[in-house]
């Protein structure tokens, strides 16, 4: 197949940087993060979308590994579990140094490309992981967090999630609370990518308006193609274009076809739509492999990216457009975020008001002074 051969040629030079992979969650779920369990060997790991041979076959050159803790940990052990998931990513990279290069910058990604390794970055999936604390946010940055998804599928005290737009959650922050605005400003200051997957439309718009740097949707598709509220509506796609931001398309069947079955061609329809509305510079891939129960026919695991690239070439995407979607768009956005950062600027210090802090098992030190 000419197009498949072309896809491989392009990807040898420009491997894919994927915005969201939940292998760390699988390592917790299957092995309680015991990487030395013989079944957890990533060269032979079975029953997952992701392992080392599949990453190699798929020309995956960069991966934001998802550090995720479920919403029921909010106001409980969310921070502990977040640290444990960051730790498993660090240990995974140290255990397979011939495959993974742990990096925290766009320059690091380029270095991994040169070494033929999978640039491995940490994305923290859900604002509840910071427990409404700017100090925790900064600590997670020091430990390698390079994107923060502002919410998962639950509101935080400072940002609203997508289920507000389905009628399944009540709005609390009308997008971003004043503390949520401080979180966005601190993420900008630190040079952390802001991820708007999982957030409400009001939160998307508020953040796109406030952020001094481009943002990403690490694993979201196009609402006009499938009317799931996990997808990005056209008016927001136009804001994505205005802000030079990025939508990394999720492959979950129910967000692709709005049914339990989907195929590779329908994923390409989402990519086409985002390209049409937001421009080729706004397109990326965030497959959500190992984080979803159903993936499209033709995209069964991470080895299948070249088949998707072949389909885009078949649809007359140019080589430059394809390279943009594979890596260049993410690198551009990441570099813009890094350039907008200012670590010499005074950090945000004003804590969340005590009456906005959820949870009953808390002390109130500092608030009484």
């Amino acid at each position: 197949d000419f197009f498949r051969d072309e896809a491989e040629r392009i990807m040898r030079d420009s491997p894919v940087i994927d915005g969201h992979n939940d292998l760390p969650w699988q390592l917790l779920d299957m092995f309680n993060n015991r990487l030395q369990d013989e079944r957890a060997n990533l060269t032979t790991l079975a029953g997952t979308h992701t392992n080392i041979p599949k990453l190699r076959a798929g020309f995956v050159g960069g991966q934001f590994w998802s550090v995720y803790t479920p919403c029921d940990t909010q106001n409980k052990d969310a921070v502990r579990r977040t640290l444990e998931q960051m730790d498993v990513v660090h240990r995974m990279c140290r255990m397979y140094p011939e495959t993974f290069l742990y990096v925290t910058s766009s320059a690091g990604i380029r270095q991994a490309f040169r070494e033929g390794k999978v640039a491995s970055l940490i994305g923290v999936e859900g604002g509840h992981s910071i427990d409404s604390s700017l100090g925790v946010l900064r600590a997670l940055y020091q430990l390698g967090m390079r994107y923060l998804t502002l919410t998962h599928s639950c509101n935080t005290p400072w940002a609203d999630n997508w289920l507000v737009d389905t009628g399944d959650s009540e709005p609390q922050s009308q997008g971003l609370s004043p503390f949520g605005q401080r979180v966005v400003k601190e993420l900008n200051r630190l040079g952390v990518l802001i991820d708007l997957a999982h957030v409400s439309v009001a939160t998307m718009k508020a953040t796109l308006q406030l952020s001094r740097a481009p943002v990403i949707f690490s694993h979201s598709s196009a609402y006009s193609v499938c009317a799931s509220r996990r997808n990005v509506p056209d008016d927001v796609l136009r804001l994505v274009k205005q802000t030079d931001s990025l939508v990394m398309v999720n492959f979950y069947n129910n967000y692709i076809s709005c049914t339990n079955k989907a195929n590779l061609s329908q994923v390409a329809d989402h990519l086409d739509h985002i390209k049409e509305v937001a421009g080729a510079r706004a397109v990326g891939f965030g497959g959500d492999f190992d984080g979803v129960p159903r993936v499209p026919e033709g995209l069964e695991d991470v080895s299948k990216y070249p088949d998707l690239i072949a389909e885009l070439l078949r649809r007359n995407w140019t080589e430059a457009e394809v390279k943009g979607a594979l890596a260049d768009n993410l690198l551009r956005v990441f570099e813009a975020v890094e350039q907008a950062s200012n670590l010499t600027q005074a950090p945000e210090e004003e804590p969340i008001p005590l009456d906005q802090l959820g949870g009953s098992c808390r002390t109130h030190y500092g608030y009484s002074s």
């Epitope: 289920l163 389905t166 009628g167 399944d168 009540e170 009317a227 799931s228 509220r229």
Partner: nanobody, 112 residues
Framework: QVQLVESGGGLVQPGGSLRLSCAAS????????MTWVRQAPGKGFEWVST????????TYAGSVKDRFTISRDNAKNTLYLQMNSLKPEDTAVYYC?????QGQGTQVTVSS
Amino acid sequence: QVQLVESGGGLVQPGGSLRLSCAASGFTFSSYGMTWVRQAPGKGFEWVSTISISGSRTTYAGSVKDRFTISRDNAKNTLYLQMNSLKPEDTAVYYCRNILVQGQGTQVTVSS
């Protein structure tokens, strides 16, 4: 089997009214927010309206505000969309959906 079945569509003149229904089965209807979306010929999906679990919160697209009313009857496992002052640009297939499933749709045509 989780299912949503829309009904009540048809041909109506501009300025006329229709009431769409959506019958739910296979899940606890009263535990989910519900939404109407529509798709005009050759166009993408467009959000129309959403109602919260209890029915206390309703939201509407600007294009239908003050003309359409969403409601639900949790005892009957049914979602409704009352459409008044219909316009030709309201012509579309109307779908009800929640986070679990989307229905097959019902055609609404507004034409004189």
